[in-house]
C-alpha cells in the first residue's frame, strides 16, 4: 500500500488552530509535475457534505512530502469530508477523513467501519441533543433509511446493513428531520472486496494474518498497519510518537500523538494513534489495553507488562505477543519484514536464529512463495545466534510475495514471514529533451517517463556523433538536474540516449530510445562598423556599414540592424538576409526621435559582436495637411489654387510646397515652393492649354507635413504650348513671380 497518512489535529477549542496534514513516505512524493510523480493534493470534498461557504482554506507545502491545510475560521468549516491524494500512476491513492461536529445532535460511536464483503455492518449514532423527530439516514448524500425517534436503543440509532458489498462503501449520515446537516453524525463505511482473510481478483489468496489491528488489502494482500506499527504483518511496534510504514515520521508537538486522528489508505480508514482513544483521541488507554484506539488487549503471560503503545513487554527468557514463548524454543532474530531486490539478480539472504539447543545450518530453511525450499549454503555460528546464508537463484517477477524463514530444533520451531519485492529496473520510454544548444555544447533534460520501478537513483547520459562507430561517451548526473554536454563539434548531429538506474545491485535498466541533437553553427566573430547614414525623410534612414577583411569564406548569413529608442524604451530590429549587403533603408521610423544604431553579423541563430553604436536624430514630422484645396482655371495657361491653413499647428509654417502633375502623364511631378506662408491662394502659370492637371500641397515647419487631398483642373482654350508652370502668390495687389 502507498505510505500516505492524513493527520487531523482534533484539539477543537479553537477552530483556527485546527489543521490537517498529509504526509507521504513514498520516494519522490509530491515533487510536483516532473517525471517523478504528481504532487500531494489535500482538499475539502464538498460533493456529499456541503457546508456554508467561508474564506478559502490555506494550503502550505512543507518540503516535498508534506502538505498542510489551515485557515478554518469557525467550527462549521471543519465539518465534512477531507481527502488527500498521493502516489503516482497506478499507485495513486486517496485517503479520506470525515470530521463530525462535537456539538451535533447525533454523534457516531465509531466513525470508520471496515467490514468484509458479505458481513453485516452496524452504524451507531449516539443521541447528543435529543429531538422528537424522525432520523433520516443518507448514503453518499442520497436518502437511505428513516427511523422513528422512538426507535432509539440505549440512546442510539442503529442502521443495520446486512450482506454488504463493495458498492455499499461511502459516507453515511444520520440526521434528525429539520436539523441542520451540520448536526448530523457522519460515518465512513469501507467494504473490502473479499471475505475475511482473503484477497486477490477472485479472492482466492490468503491474507498474511495482519497483527495489531492491521487490515489486509483486498487488492495486493499487504497489511495496512495501524499508526504506530510496522512490518509485513504489523508485528513490530514503533517507538512512542512515531508512525509511517517504516516508523519514519514523528508526531508534531510535545504531547506526541495525543489529539491526532490518523487516516490511512483503504481499507484501514481512520483511528487514533497507538496508545490513544476517544472521539478526540485525547484519552490514554485503560490498563491492559494498547494500540490504535486502544482496541487491543495485552493478556501478557509469564510476568510480561502491558505498554499502551507496543503491547506486552516480556521479561528475559520469554518472547511472543503475549510473552507465551520460552526463549528455549528457537526464535528467528531481527528478520527484516520487507526486502527489495532487482529483477534477474542473485541475492544472498541471511536468516539468524537462537535457541536451546542451538540451531545449526541444516535446521534453518528458506521457503519461496511457490513453495520451493532453499537450504543454506553456509552458516556463521556465534555464541548467541546462528546466521544461515542462502544463495537465491536468479529472481523472476513471480518471486515477489511472502517468503518464510523457518528454524526447527528439538526445542520446537519458529518461522518468520517477510515480503520480497522484486523490482523491475527502469527503462526510459522516451528520448531525452534538448533544452538549448550552442556550437560546442548541448543542454539536455534527462527527466523522461519510464517503465519499471523507481525511485531513480542515477541517470546516465550516453552520447556520440551520429553515424559514428566510436565508443559512447557517458556522463552520470543527478536525477533532478539538467545536463550540459560540453566540448562538442559545431554543426554536428549527436545521438543521445538515457539509461536509468534504481537502488540496489542490478538496478541498471536498458538504454532508452536515441534522439538526434545537433550543435549550433560556429558563432560569427567579425565586428562590423558603421560607415555612415543619412536621413531620407522624417521617418526614413539609409545606413551603410563595412566588415574587416579576413582570409577564407565569410561565416555569416546576414546582418541585424538594431535601433534603440531610449525615450520610449523600444527596440526596432531589421533583418538584412544577405551577407553581401552593406547598406539598408530603414523606413517607418518615428520622426523627431533620437535613435542609437548598431549592426551585427548573424550565423544561424547566433549573433556576432555589435558594431560601435551611432546616434541618429530624425527630424520631427511636419504639420497637418492644408484643408479644402480648390483649383480654378483662369485661362489657357493659368490655374488658381486656394486653400485653408492646417489646423492644430505645432509652430509657424515656413512655406508651402505645391505638387503639379499632368493627369495620366508618365513624367515626374514638379514641386513649387510658396514662400509666403500667410497666403491662402496662389496662381500657377505657364501651363499647357486644354490640359488636365493634378495638384496637391503640403506645409513645412521644421519638416515637411502631410499632403492635402489631390484636386484636378483643366486649363482653358487652345493656346500655344507653354514653357512650364510657374506660380504667383496673391499678396494684396502684388503679383510676384516665384
Amino acid at each position: 500500500a502507498v505510505d500516505l497518512t492524513l493527520l487531523a489535529n482534533l484539539r477543537l477549542t479553537d477552530p483556527q488552530r485546527f489543521f490537517l496534514t498529509c504526509v507521504s513516505g513514498e520516494a519522490g512524493a509530491g515533487r510536483g509535475s516532473d517525471a517523478w510523480g504528481p504532487p500531494l493534493l489535500l482538499e475539502k470534498d464538498d460533493r456529499i457534505v456541503r457546508t456554508p461557504p467561508g474564506p478559502p482554506l490555506r494550503l502550505a507545502r512543507n518540503g516535498s512530502h508534506q502538505v498542510t491545510l489551515r485557515g478554518f475560521s469557525k467550527p462549521s468549516d471543519l465539518v465534512g469530508v477531507f481527502s488527500c491524494v498521493g502516489g503516482a500512476g497506478a499507485r495513486r491513492t486517496r485517503v479520506i477523513y470525515v470530521h463530525n461536529s462535537p456539538g451535533a445532535h447525533l454523534l457516531p460511536d465509531k466513525v470508520t467501519h471496515t467490514v468484509n464483503k458479505g458481513d453485516t455492518a452496524v452504524l451507531s449514532a449516539r443521541v447528543h441533543k435529543e429531538k422528537q423527530t424522525d432520523v433520516i439516514w443518507k448514503s453518499n448524500g442520497s436518502y437511505f433509511y428513516t427511523l422513528d425517534w422512538h426507535e432509539a436503543q440505549d440512546g442510539r440509532f442503529l442502521l443495520q446493513l446486512p450482506n454488504v458489498q463493495p458498492p455499499s462503501s461511502g459516507i453515511y449520515s444520520a440526521t434528525y428531520l429539520e436539523a441542520s446537516p451540520l448536526g448530523s453524525a457522519f460515518f465512513r463505511l469501507i467494504v473490502r472486496g473479499c471475505g475475511a482473510g482473503r484477497w486477490g481478483p477472485g479472492c482466492t489468496k490468503e491474507c498474511p494474518g495482519c497483527l495489531h489491528g492491521g487490515v489486509c488489502h483486498d487488492h495486493d494482500g499487504e497489511c495496512v498497519c495501524p499508526p504506530g506499527f510496522t512490518g509485513t504483518r504489523c508485528e513490530q511496534a514503533c517507538r512512542e510518537g512515531r508512525f509511517g510504514q517504516s516508523c519514519q515520521e514523528q508526531c508534531p508537538g510535545i504531547s506526541g500523538c495525543r489529539g491526532l486522528t490518523f487516516c490511512l489508505p483503504d481499507p484501514y480508514g481512520c483511528s487514533c494513534g497507538s496508545g490513544w482513544r476517544g472521539s478526540q483521541c485525547q484519552e490514554a488507554c485503560a490498563p491492559g489495553h494498547f494500540g490504535a484506539d486502544c482496541r487491543l488487549q495485552c493478556q501478557c503471560q509469564n510476568g510480561g507488562t502491558c505498554d499502551r503503545f507496543s503491547g506486552c513487554v516480556c521479561p528475559s527468557g520469554w518472547h511472543g505477543v503475549h510473552c507465551e514463548k520460552s526463549d528455549r524454543i528457537p526464535q528467528i532474530l531481527n528478520m527484516a519484514s520487507e526486502l527489495e531486490f532487482n529483477l534477474e539478480t542473485m541475492p544472498r539472504i541471511n536468516c539468524a536464529a537462537a535457541g536451546n539447543p542451538f540451531p545449526v545450518r541444516g535446521s534453518i530453511e528458506l521457503r519461496k512463495p511457490d513453495g520451493t525450499v532453499l537450504l543454506s549454503t553456509k552458516a556463521i555460528v556465534e555464541p548467541e545466534k546462528t546466521t544461515a546464508e542462502f544463495e537465491v537463484p536468479r529472481l523472476v517477477l513471480a518471486d515477489s510475495g511472502f517468503w518464510e524463514c523457518r528454524v526447527s530444533t528439538s526445542g520446537g520451531q519458529d518461522s518468520r514471514r517477510f515480503k520480497v519485492n522484486v523490482k523491475v529496473p527502469p527503462v526510459p520510454l522516451a528520448a531525452p529533451r534538448l533544452l538549448t544548444k550552442q556550437s560546442r555544447q548541448l543542454v539536455v533534460s534527462p527527466l523522461v517517463s519510464f517503465s519499471g520501478d523507481g525511485p531513480i537513483s542515477t541517470v546516465r547520459l550516453h552520447y556520440r556523433p551520429q553515424d559514428s562507430t566510436m565508443d559512447w561517451s557517458t556522463i552520470v548526473v543527478d536525477p533532478s538536474e539538467n545536463v550540459t554536454l560540453m566540448n562538442l563539434r559545431p554543426k554536428t548531429g549527436y545521438s543521445v540516449r538515457v539509461q536509468l538506474s534504481r537502488p540496489g545491485e542490478g538496478g541498471e535498466g536498458a538504454w532508452g530510445p536515441p534522439t538526434l541533437m545537433t550543435t549550433d553553427c560556429p558563432e560569427p566573430l567579425l565586428q562590423p562598423w558603421l560607415e555612415g547614414w543619412h536621413v531620407e525623410g522624417t521617418d526614413r534612414l539609409r545606413v551603410s556599414w563595412s566588415l574587416p577583411l579576413v582570409p577564407g569564406p565569410l561565416v555569416g548569413d546576414g546582418f541585424l540592424l538594431r535601433l534603440w529608442d531610449g525615450t520610449r524604451g523600444q527596440e526596432r530590429r531589421e533583418n538584412v538576409s544577405s551577407p553581401q549587403a552593406r547598406t539598408a533603408l530603414l523606413t517607418g521610423l518615428t520622426p523627431g526621435t533620437h535613435y542609437q544604431l548598431d549592426v551585427q553579423l548573424y550565423h544561424c541563430t547566433l549573433l556576432g559582436p555589435a558594431s560601435p553604436p551611432a546616434h541618429v536624430l530624425l527630424p520631427p514630422s511636419g504639420p497637418p495637411a492644408p484643408r479644402h484645396l480648390h483649383a480654378q482655371a483662369l485661362s489657357d495657361s493659368e490655374i488658381q489654387l486656394t486653400w485653408k491653413h492646417p489646423e492644430a499647428l505645432p509652430g509657424p509654417i515656413s512655406k508651402y510646397v505645391v505638387e503639379v502633375q499632368v493627369a495620366g502623364g508618365a513624367g515626374d511631378p514638379l514641386w513649387i515652393d510658396v514662400d509666403r506662408p500667410e497666403e491662402t491662394s496662389t496662381i500657377i502659370r505657364g501651363l499647357n492649354a486644354s490640359t488636365r492637371y493634378l495638384f496637391r500641397m503640403r506645409a513645412s515647419i521644421q519638416g515637411l507635413g502631410d499632403w492635402s487631398n489631390t484636386v484636378e483642373e483643366s486649363t482653358l482654350g487652345n493656346g500655344l504650348q507653354a514653357e512650364g508652370p510657374v506660380q504667383e502668390s496673391r499678396a494684396a495687389e502684388e503679383g510676384l513671380d516665384q
Epitope: 423527530t133 433520516i136 437511505f144 422513528d148 425517534w149
Partner: antibody
Amino acid sequence: EVQLLESGGGLVQPGGSLRLSCAASGFTFSRYVMGWVRQAPGKGLEWVSRIYPSGGFTYYADSVKGRFTISRDNSKNTLYLQMNSLRAEDTAVYYCTRIREGYFDYWGQGTLVTVSS
Amino acid sequence: QYELTQPASVSGSPGQSITISCTGTSSDVGGYNYVSWYQQHPGKAPKLTIFDVTKRPSGVSDRFSGSKSDNTASLTISGLQAEDEADYYCGSYTSSGSRVFGTGTKVTVL
C-alpha cells in the same frame, strides 16, 4: 420507475371490515416510510396512517385510531391497511404513498372504499 | 383533524401568473421547512409538485415555484397554461410528527 398499486377496495356495510393492499416496485421498499392518504368524494386529502421501515412503529389519524391497522411485509414489497368497524364517513379513495423527509413523493392510483347499507 | 387554510379557487388567463396561499401555524408551516404542494387533475392521483418549500422534483416545470413567509406558504404558477387547471393541495410536517394537508384550491384557466 417507482410504482404503487392499490387493491382491495369495494362496497362494504357499516361496521364491516376491509383489507387494502399496496404492491410496491421500482425502489427498495424496505428502506422507506409508507403511508395511506384518503380523499372523500368531492373533498380534500386526509392523512390516515404511516408505518416505518422496520414495521415496528405506526401512527394514525385520530379519526381512524383503534379501528384501522397499518402493516407491511418487506419480503413481499407490500403495504396493508386493515379497516374494521367501518363507518359511512370512511367512504373515500384510499391512496398508498411513499413518504420522504416531510412529504409524500409517490402516490398510487387509488382504490375506492364505499361504506353504505 | 385540523387542516391548513387555502383559498377555494383561483383563476387566471393563459400566460398570467397566479399565486395560491396556504396558511397554518408555527406548529406546522411556520415551524418547519417541510411544506409540499400537490397537483391533482380530476379523477387522478395527486402528484408532488414542490417539496421542502422551494424544491422542484425532476420532471416538474420551472413555471412552478414555492416560497414561505412566517406561517404562510405560497405556490406561484407563472405563464399559466391550460394543463395547469387542477386542484392544488399544500401539505406540511407538524410538531407531532404527523402530516397535514390544506383545504385545496381549484385553479381555473380562463
